[in-house]
């Protein structure tokens, strides 16, 4: 029989490396998405980013972000999203609840959804990295 392993203790700089990788990949995704001309950002979509009532890195809404990016992957075949999802999974607890996303059906609206979420994801990873590094600085002072 098997016993559950002890909780995994990851050094904060390992978590930071994951978020740095996500930040870099988010820029790649946004650059790719922005190549589509004539598409405007929409106010109708909001990507959950950081939770104010949790400590880094658990303050990142990774399960919801994953669900939004999975939706983009289904709408537009961006292979970089596969790698993004693999890294997000390093931050997602196995028992995290699922997030349901309502997908736009109109082609142009889909493009607006993709651009908006990609832009918000890039900004979110910048914020996440800032919250991680400032948290690390506070921990050492």
């Amino acid at each position: 029989s098997h016993t559950l392993p002890v909780r995994l203790l990851r050094p904060s700089d390992d978590v930071q490396k994951i978020v740095e990788e996500l930040q870099s990949l988010s820029k790649m995704l946004l650059k790719d998405v922005e190549e589509e001309k004539g598409v405007l950002v929409s106010q109708n979509y909001t990507l959950p980013c950081l939770s104010p009532d949790a400590q880094p890195p658990n303050n990142i809404h990774s399960p919801a972000i994953r669900a939004y990016l999975k939706t983009i992957r289904q709408l537009d075949n961006k292979s970089v999203i596969d790698e993004i999802i693999e890294h997000l999974d390093k931050l997602i607890f196995q028992d995290a609840p699922e997030t349901n996303i309502s997908v736009p059906t109109d082609t142009h609206e889909c493009k607006r959804f993709i651009l908006t979420i990609s832009q918000q994801f890039s900004e979110c990873m910048d914020l996440a990295l800032k919250s991680l590094t400032s948290g690390a600085q506070q921990a050492t002072t």
Epitope: H2, L4, P5, R7, L8, R10, P11, D14, K17, I18, K70, D82, E83, I85, E86, H87, D89, K90, L91, I92, F93, Q94, D95, A96, E98
Partner: antibody, heavy 122, light 107 residues
Framework: QVQLVQSGAEVKKPGSSVKVSCKAS????????MQWVRQAPGQGLEWMGA????????RYSQKFKGRVTITADKSTSTAYMELSSLRSEDTAVYYC???????????????WGQGTTVTVSS | AIQMTQSPSSLSASVGDRVTITCRAS??????LAWYQQKPGKVPKLLIY???TSASGVPSRFSGSRSGTDYTLTISSLQPEDVATYYC?????????FGGGTKVEIK
């Protein structure tokens, strides 16, 4: 107790396909990646691909792309690995494996199936 | 794809010897590495995950460490039952490649 039970040994002709199953029991979580690995006689372990059973999301080794298809049936907690256009070099033991731990991403494969021997011979 | 270069491919040591096996990753994998033991005709068994955490029930003589992109599995005092082939595998990004394996024998 977590268990992975694979289907029985297969003998196949070159050019045909094989589908190996892997049934999980005693595991309740949905956010995890299961992998498929093979081992040719006297050789090392070779990663073939992985599936996220909750969504059917898959990743494949470049070497097997186009020849391997990994699927999962959530209702029966069973994963499948199908390899087509078989050749003699595909004679190997095929394993499914999956992790235990607190994150969706693996950092080690804790549980392994017993292995399925596939022999490709004319 | 990230390459895992494992060395040596085989080694022979005496009972009680300290044995080290190394895997070098072609890029930084930030501790996302596991070590497995496979005895002849048996299923691989997880020894170490996340570079240095021992799996449940693994004898304390097995340990893992890291220096940059080099990961080491150490058997502090080799026992007859440790005769096996040892593999590393990374999990930083797919494909989750394995090292070529190290066959450990008793002198």
């Amino acid at each position: 107790q977590v268990q992975l039970v694979q289907s029985g040994a297969e003998v196949k002709k070159p050019g045909s396909s094989v589908k190996v199953s892997c049934k999980a029991s005693g595991y309740t979580r949905t956010r995890y990646w299961m992998q498929w690995v093979r081992q040719a006689p006297g050789q090392g372990l070779e990663w073939m691909g992985a599936i996220y059973p909750g969504e059917g999301d898959t990743r494949y080794s470049q070497k097997f792309k186009g020849r391997v298809t990994i699927t999962a049936d959530k209702s029966t907690s069973t994963a499948y690995m199908e390899l087509s256009s078989l050749r003699s070099e595909d004679t190997a033991v095929y394993y499914c494996a999956f992790p235990e731990g607190q994150y969706a991403a693996p950092y080690g494969m804790h549980y392994w199936g017993q292995g399925t021997t596939v022999t490709v011979s004319s | 794809a990230i390459q895992m270069t494992q060395s040596p491919s085989s080694l022979s040591a005496s009972v009680g010897d300290r044995v080290t096996i190394t895997c070098r990753a072609s890029r930084n994998i930030h501790n996302y590495l596991a070590w497995y033991q496979q005895k002849p005709g048996k299923v691989p068994k997880l020894l170490i995950y996340y570079a240095k955490t021992s799996a449940s029930g693994v004898p304390s003589r097995f340990s893992g460490s890291r220096s940059g992109t080099d990961y080491t599995l150490t058997i502090s005092s080799l026992q007859p039952e440790d005769v096996a082939t040892y593999y590393c595998q990374h999990f930083w990004k797919t494909p989750w490649t394995f090292g070529g394996g190290t066959k450990v024998e008793i002198k």
